[in-house]
């Protein structure tokens, strides 16, 4: 038995946890072991999110925002753990949040700082507007505001325009880039700083193919190393550009290793994919299959474009019974 | 060592207030549960009121319950019982009381007690 | 609200003597009762906590057992600095209520 009159001064201690939206986390603390455990959470030093004594939770008083979304791990308190587990965090959770832990010999305070993160993956849009080409780097939703680079040819671009707009709790942003009559490779880096994540695009234009109709045409798209890791889910999407809009050729899921193919032409090498080799190949041309082609690869940390522009022209014989 | 020091008691009539003080010393105060108990002289105790570590808490005795206030100032180490329309039955000694933890358990240290006397 | 009920409400015993109070709740309070010694003229000093756990510093002859609504606190052989009122006091939840006490003296 220890004397109740033995109170140990335990410095308050600050934790940083980093949390993703809509996911679940866990606000540490620990104690030295004790009788009588007495565990309350508090939020900003005001709002009761978690409250346990006398062996049981009690919430009569807890904030309705924390409803259903906090529990501790009650077969862990008597080995001196009373960290909280906390369901769906938002925007809104940000901030500090104070465990007290009392037992019969000491009481302790600890602080944990809860930042919250957002980060809607990424993507790389090729658009065309008018006689305009554009590529358009755009997250849906981040938070904290996100650090945006270009790169043209590996070099960093100064000109860097963001079209962003703010909801309650995160960032939707825009970044075009003017790429008009370019033969450039581009890069776009997206980097949410707080969860440490980065996403790039990258988008490279192939030279020019000029076909005869019902010719056949082999067209490459090959990851570049320094982004693709075949562990990684990825999908990969052959669309066809008309009249400014793309139609999906096929697309393929690693996932699954799926490949689901809409346009009867169109085939794919098996094996080359297995190499990870995402090169196609259109048969029996026509002249209504010229246009630009988009090899789109994409994953959680990158978009991969490649772009081919393919003039299919009348064949000798077409051309002589015109 | 764990100090707690009452004052504010005295002499005071029927329907009267009194606020009654309790210095601490000798511990993290904002750490613990603070408790009033109550004894008339040669009669046995009475619980009259507890406040939690953080003053998010308080609870009473029915026997006081509307006419009592238990409050905390943690920046002064200081517990306080405010006394509003006080009756003769209120007379006792009034004792400052350190909860063992937040402010749902027992007693583990009590102070000399004030005397409060209600009396025409 | 729980009522506490004690008795004796008085004994008087010789030195030696096992002494038996009892402490009823009228309704289950787990073990969350505390036992207090009060001498003629001082503060209450806390005894048992928790139905059965002896306070630090305080002597082995005394013991507390029981729970749900019947406890009972013994002093195994009565000393002359026994002499006191006793009080339980229950705290599994607000009010926080005190038994009425015993009065321990010595025959």
């Known amino acids: 038995i220890f004397p109740l009159a033995f109170f140990i001064y335990v410095p308050m201690n600050e934790q940083i946890v980093i949390g993703r939206l809509d996911e679940d986390i866990i606000l540490p603390s620990s104690f030295e072991r004790g009788s009588e455990v007495v565990i309350h959470w508090k939020y900003q030093d005001s709002y009761k999110v978690h409250s346990y004594y006398k062996g049981s939770d009690h919430l009569e008083s807890q904030d309705p925002r924390y409803a259903n979304r906090t529990s501790l791990f009650y077969n862990e308190i008597q080995n001196g753990n009373a960290s909280l587990f906390f369901r769906r965090v938002s925007l809104l959770d940000e901030g500090i949040y104070t465990c007290y832990v009392g037992t019969a010999i000491q009481v302790i305070t600890n602080k944990v700082v809860l930042k919250v993160g957002v980060f809607l993956t990424p993507v790389m849009k090729y658009e065309k507007r008018n006689t305009n080409s554009f590529l358009i780097c755009s997250v849906l939703s981040v938070y904290p505001r996100p650090i945006i680079t270009w790169k043209m040819d590996n070099t960093p671009i100064s000109e860097n325009n963001m079209e962003e707009t703010g909801s309650l709790d995160s960032f939707s942003i825009n970044s075009p880039l003017n790429i008009t009559g370019s033969n450039s490779s581009y890069e776009c880096t997206i980097e949410n700083s707080l969860l440490k994540q980065t996403w790039t695009g990258r988008w490279t234009m192939k030279d020019g193919l000029h076909k005869m109709q019902s010719e056949h045409v082999s067209l490459s798209c090959q990851p570049v190393n320094d982004y693709f890791s075949p562990n990684q889910d990825f999908k990969v999407t052959w669309s066809r550009m008309k009249s400014g809009t793309f139609s999906v050729l096929a697309y393929y899921l690693s996932s699954s290793q799926n490949t689901i193919i809409n346009e009867s032409r169109f085939s794919w090498n098996k094996e080359l994919i297995n190499q990870s080799d995402f090169s196609m190949n259109l048969m029996d041309l026509n002249l209504s299959d010229s246009g630009e082609y988009l090899c789109n690869i994409s994953s959680d940390e990158y978009t991969l474009l490649t772009i081919h522009t393919v003039h299919v022209e009348p064949s000798q014989e077409t051309a002589s019974h015109n | 060592q764990v100090q707690l020091v009452e004052s504010g008691g005295g002499v005071v009539q029927p329907g009267r207030s009194l606020r009654l003080s309790c210095a601490a010393s000798g511990f993290t105060f904002s750490n613990y549960g603070m408790h009033w108990v109550r004894q008339v002289p040669g009669k046995g105790l009475e619980w009259v009121a507890v406040?939690?570590?953080?003053?998010?808490?308080?609870d009473y005795a029915d026997s006081v319950k509307g006419r009592f206030t238990i409050s905390r100032d943690n920046s002064k180490n200081t517990l306080y019982l405010q006394m509003n329309s006080l009756r003769v039955e209120d007379t006792a000694v009034y004792y400052c009381?350190?909860?063992?933890?937040?402010?749902?358990?027992?007693?583990?240290?009590w102070g000399q007690g004030t005397l409060v006397t209600v009396s025409s | 609200d729980i009522q506490m009920t004690q008795s004796p409400s008085s004994l008087s015993a010789s030195v030696g003597d096992r002494v038996t109070i009892t402490c009823r709740a009228s309704?289950?309070?787990?073990?969350?009762l505390a036992w207090y010694q009060q001498k003629p003229g001082k503060v209450p000093k806390l005894l048992i906590y928790?139905?059965?756990t002896l306070q630090s510093g305080v002597p082995s002859r005394f013991s507390g057992s029981g729970s749900g609504t019947d406890f009972t606190l013994t002093i195994s052989s009565l000393q002359p600095e026994d002499v006191a009122t006793y009080y339980c006091?229950?705290?599994?939840?607000?009010?926080?209520?005190f038994g009425p006490g015993t009065k321990v003296d010595i025959k």
């Open positions: 006091q229950k705290y599994n939840a607000a009010p926080f209520t």
């Open positions: 928790a139905a059965s």
């Open positions: 009381a350190k909860d063992l933890i937040s402010g749902i358990y027992y007693v583990d240290h």
């Open positions: 309704q289950g309070i787990s073990n969350y």
């Open positions: 406040i939690w570590y953080d003053g998010s808490e308080k």
